[in-house]
């Protein structure tokens, strides 16, 4: 018994005053406590506990399952213990078939022995199978057998205690080992989206997939510099024996535009930690945003093609979208398309194809453009550059010589006078009156330009060049003089292109 | 003995709170598992969430979060479960029972059950 | 949710008789399957964890076996006091789930 020193308080005194004590099956087991501050006795045997308040223990007819450590306590919290062995030979084990190891740690096989006196005691592989040669173990008669160092390769070993007894070897009933994996990498995270874009007032909820070897791997979602514990929900799945895997969701179920920011999937094991976020932006409605992908102001030449090209976000989803031209809407000669085929994708291209433009083709080409919240438009002022053409070339009566163009850009109209027979004509002759004519066509069409000169200044017999030109090309019409005596006549008036 | 002992059967109103109990005894109370197991009238088990005593770690059935609380007092070997506001569909059997100790801490079965708490919801 | 299907719903046999209940999972739960034995108006009782091992003090007659997606329950005589309701449980994973049940009764 121990002993202290006088004034300190002690521990208690069991009667009889031995560690172990063995006694036989249907035996009286009768265990005295003495301790003026008694408080209890407990009796634990594998995961089982009982308290007795009663200072004597007292068991009329012991079982084998009466066998394990008795512990007196005081008021102190002092205690003393002894360890009871029932010895029944139809009963040489408890045990507790629950047998879980921790990789590289040492498991404890859970059958302790109703008799200590029994030999050999070990571990035995099932159906007559030998143990692993690396498996190494500790028998302990009063707790059972501790393997040490669990491997992987150990899981679900079948296993069973055994003793000699009277010289045959008696086993226990069945052990299957499950080996825990220690973590030898972080855990594997990763999310059903990057990014979120919702509407006031619609559900937020996102997925992270946790991978690692065993369940034993914490994750939580955190939001980016906040505390608040997150509500999530959880999905998990052994797929094989050092596979498991867990689908934690987050749900907002009405998300608000304060709700916007970075929410981070954590998950760390023993071994480290890693994470993922995603990012959720909640606008108070939808938007359309169109980006030209030209200058909205458009130069083509005549009968040249050109792509009329937007890019725009739209959230929600584009319902409907269309391109018009002097209000009439184009059922072809266009296409729209997805700038991605992300989920997340927002961003979309609309292009309007026209081919072989003619001068007549030039205006405003809109693209309209609709969801759920909102609508949208961009105009394109489409130019069709055309090589000017000579309308009119006439004598008025007033003597003067005029001539009308028209083209795009604006056509400038110069006059050349050549004397005789020469084919250049290389005198300028400056013009009296120059206007732009307002043209009774649409706008975008050609420019009208009327030009005149007084014929009266030519003396000799030639030819008077009306020249219009433009950056696309250039037209000329004639008109020849001939005198007879004091009269001037105009010979038909011609034109020649000159490219 | 190794045994779950839960509180007594209850009758309430609708929108009225309610915590029901469940003990153990005769083993560890830290080293396992407890999980809560619904039968409603005529129907079949289920489960419901398990906490783990020594840290209050907890996990539910997605159509029970929110809905329902589990928690435990490790001093006193006692896990509760608790309504804020109770509906008539609440009326079942309620048992809590033990998890074998299962490697990963809850992935085994259920291997000791208390006696049931009969909740009735009714106007 | 991993869903766990009992067949049959209910049977009929006589004392005696050799029973076998099967539970089906829709996706594999290695051998992380319980059994059950339900009688009116009392709590559950494990019969059977991981899938084939009997629990302690439970009658030699029951048996379970199978692992991956199926899993049977044999009762190898049926006993009078065997006619009670027959669960099967997953604990795979999270949430873990039960089988509609089985109810065994007296032909």
């Known amino acids: 018994q121990p002993s202290v020193s006088p004034g300190e308080p002690s521990p208690p005194s069991i009667h009889p005053g031995k560690s172990d004590l063995i006694v036989r099956v249907g035996d009286e087991i009768r265990l005295l406590c003495t301790d003026p501050g008694f408080v209890k006795w407990t009796f634990e045997i594998l995961d089982e506990t009982n308290e007795n308040k009663q200072n004597e223990w007292i068991t009329e007819k012991a079982e084998a399952t009466n066998t394990g450590k008795y512990t007196c306590t005081n008021k102190h919290g002092l205690s003393n213990s002894i360890y009871v062995f029932v010895r029944d030979p139809a009963k040489l084990f408890l045990v507790d078939r629950s047998l879980y190891g921790k990789e590289d740690n040492d498991t404890l096989v859970r059958c302790p022995l109703t008799d200590p006196e029994v030999t050999n005691y070990s571990l035995k592989g099932c159906q007559g199978k030998p143990l692993p040669k690396d498996l190494r173990f500790i028998p302990d008669p009063k707790a059972g057998i501790m393997i040490k160092s669990v491997k992987r390769a150990y899981h679900r070993l079948c296993l069973h205690c055994s003793v000699d007894q009277e010289g045959k070897s008696v086993l226990s009933e069945k052990f299957i080992l499950k080996v825990r994996p220690a973590f030898k990498a972080v855990p594997v995270v990763s999310v059903s989206k990057a990014s979120y874009l919702l509407r006031e007032g619609e559900e937020f909820t996102v997925t992270c997939t946790i991978k690692d070897v065993s369940s034993s791997v914490y994750s939580t979602w955190k939001r980016e510099n906040s505390q608040t514990k997150l509500q999530e929900k959880y999905n998990s799945w052994h797929h094989g024996d050092f596979n498991y895997e867990r689908q934690a969701t987050l749900t907002i179920s009405s998300a608000r535009v304060n709700d916007s920011g970075v929410f981070m999937c954590y998950a760390n094991n023993t071994f480290g930690s890693a994470n993922v976020t995603t990012t959720l932006e909640v606008v108070d409605k939808g938007f359309i945003n169109i980006f030209p992908m030209i200058n909205t102001t458009v130069f083509v030449n005549d009968g040249e093609n050109v792509d009329l090209i937007v890019e725009y976000e739209a959230f929600p989803k584009p319902e409907h979208q269309q391109w018009i031209y002097m209000n009439r809407t184009f059922t072809d000669k266009w296409e729209d398309y997805p700038k991605s085929e992300n989920e997340s994708n927002i961003r979309y291209v609309s292009e309007l194809h026209l081919t072989r433009l003619k001068g007549t083709e030039g205006g405003t080409y809109t693209f309209l453009v609709s969801n759920s919240d909102v609508n949208a438009a961009i105009a394109f002022n489409v130019y069709v550059n055309t090589k000017p053409e000579i309308l009119t070339y006439d004598r008025l009566v007033n003597g003067m010589l005029q001539c009308v163009a028209a083209g795009f850009p604006e056509p400038t109209i110069d006059w050349y006078f050549c004397p005789g027979t020469e084919q250049r004509c290389s005198a300028s002759v400056l013009p009296v009156d120059v206007q732009t004519l307002n043209s009774s066509g649409p706008p975008f069409g050609k420019l009208v330009v009327q030009s005149s000169i007084d014929s009266s200044a030519f003396k000799h017999n030639g030819t008077v060049e009306c020249k219009a030109y433009n950056d696309v090309g250039k037209t000329s019409a004639y008109f020849n003089f001939a005198f007879k005596g004091n009269n001037k006549e105009q010979i038909h008036p011609h034109t020649l292109f000159t490219p | 003995e190794v045994q779950l002992v839960q509180s007594g059967a209850e009758v309430k109103k609708p929108g009225e709170s309610l915590k029901i109990s469940c003990k153990g005894s005769?083993?560890?109370?830290?080293?396992?598992?407890i999980g809560w197991v619904r039968q409603m009238p005529g129907k079949g088990l289920e489960w419901m969430a398990i906490?783990?005593?020594?840290?209050?770690?907890?996990r539910y059935r997605p159509s029970f979060q929110g809905q329902v609380t589990i928690s435990a007092d490790k001093s006193i070997s006692t896990a509760y479960l608790q309504w804020s506001s109770l509906k008539a569909s609440d009326t079942a059997m309620y048992y809590c029972?033990?998890?074998?100790?299962?490697?990963?801490?809850?992935?085994?079965?259920?291997?000791?059950w208390g006696q049931g708490t009969l909740v009735t919801v009714s106007s | 949710d991993i869903q766990m299907t009992q067949s049959p719903s209910s049977l009929s046999a006589s004392v005696g008789d050799r029973v076998t209940i099967t539970c089906r999972s829709s996706?594999?739960?290695?051998?992380?399957l319980g059994w059950y034995q339900q009688k009116p108006g009392k709590a559950p009782k494990l019969l059977i964890y991981d899938a084939s091992n009997l629990e302690t003090g439970v009658p030699s007659r029951f048996s379970g076996s199978g692992s991956g997606t199926d899993f049977t329950l044999t009762i190898s005589s049926l006993q009078p006091e065997d006619f009670a309701t027959y669960y099967c449980?997953?604990?795979?994973?999270?949430?873990?789930?039960f089988g509609g049940g089985t109810k065994v009764e007296i032909k």
């Open positions: 005769g083993y560890s109370f830290t080293n396992y598992w």
């Open positions: 906490i783990n005593p020594r840290d209050s770690d907890t």
């Open positions: 449980q997953q604990a795979n994973g999270f949430p873990l789930t």
């Open positions: 029972a033990r998890h074998g100790r299962g490697y990963e801490g809850y992935e085994g079965a259920f291997d000791i």
């Open positions: 996706q594999g739960i290695r051998s992380d």
